[in-house]
Amino acid sequence: LPEMAQPVDPAHNVSRLHRLPRDCQELFQVGERQSGLFEIQPQGSPPFLVNCKMTSDGGWTVIQRRHDGSVDFNRPWEAYKAGFGDPHGEFWLGLEKVHSITGDRNSRLAVQLRDWDGNAELLQFSVHLGGEDTAYSLQLTAPVAGQLGATTVPPSGLSVPFSTWDQDHDLRRDKNCAKSLSGGWWFGTCSHSNLNGQYFRSIPQQRQKLKKGIFWKTWRGRYYPLQATTMLIQPMAAEAAS
């Protein structure tokens, strides 16, 4: 049986954990309220370092962060599987690590977007992430919270595999989205979103170049390269995917 957090003082509901936490949410549950770097060890996985964001909604694991273009995100499948970048700066945690955190549970995925005028948007989805045998398919398991869901992600129930330039799993037969755009992503038809695209500090004149950028179509449009993005995940307690 999995080791549970031991109550230290039931009157104050303080818990203690005698192993590395499984994820950021478990850290939150034992009283950790400070965001930052922690080593975690999901069931059956070696330990690894994560950024935890502690909020009123609990502990979230940061799985992606972009804000200055310091890290090249145009990488092959193995890099997206393992993870890359700097935990203090820009990074992609790694699909295998994310899957080890979520397991077979449904999860909340939060997406924070920022444009160059200081405007910000927060989106939340209920999702299920498959393992490598599904090409880490992302499935929407509930309607999207907020205004921007409709054309951003696949309809509820549809699974979209992850794609890179060297592993084309997108839903376009005539095109390799990762090759014609940039970076690895859950590409459906290439045009809805790509938060792992090329980072532009200034807007290029040529649309052909512009389409390779970081975008979220239903927020600032297909050809607006965003200034910053953060993706966070939080598994839902004891809730397996149907």
């Epitope: 203690r16 954990l17 590395l20 850290l27 009283g31 950790e32 080593e39 935890c52």
Partner: nanobody
Framework: EVQLVESGGGLVQPGGSLRLSCAAS???????????MGWFRQAPGKEREFVAA????????PYADSVKGRFAISRDNAKNTVALQMNSLKPEDTAVYYC????????????????WGQGTQVTVSS
């Protein structure tokens, strides 16, 4: 100057107990409660290995499988100290024990520790 100073090591018989203590001092440790702390050990001819760690608030205390149920780590943030209570000691626990401090919230991996003490020798023998 940053300093971690271990004490409490010595010679003990199998089945016996020892309590190691580590005192942190220096400008860096004026905010001791912003560091997680850990104990590591190194036996002759072997690599340094993780023993136990404690988070900033003391609520997360991972242990190496080999010491689980026998060792207990604790900290006193008011006194800038961390202790390792070692019970039911075995000959294989013989090693130099090191105290270390990390800016990571909790960690069991050596490379995440920034500051190290000089170590204290623990010998378990009859």
């Amino acid at each position: 100057e940053v300093q971690l100073v271990e004490s409490g090591g010595g010679l003990v018989q199998p089945g016996g107990s020892l309590r190691l203590s580590c005192a942190a001092s220096g400008r860096t440790f004026s905010t001791f409660n912003t560091y997680s702390m850990g104990w590591f050990r190194q036996a002759p001819g072997k690599e340094r290995e993780f023993v136990a760690a404690i988070s900033r608030g003391g609520n997360v205390t991972p242990y190496a499988d080999s010491v689980k149920g026998r060792f207990a780590i604790s900290r006193d943030n008011a006194k800038n100290t961390v202790a390792l209570q070692m019970n039911s000691l075995k000959p294989e626990d013989t090693a130099v024990y090191y105290c270390a401090a990390s800016k990571i919230g909790i960690a069991s991996t050596i490379r995440y520790y920034d500051y190290w003490g000089q170590g204290t020798q623990v010998t378990v023998s009859s």
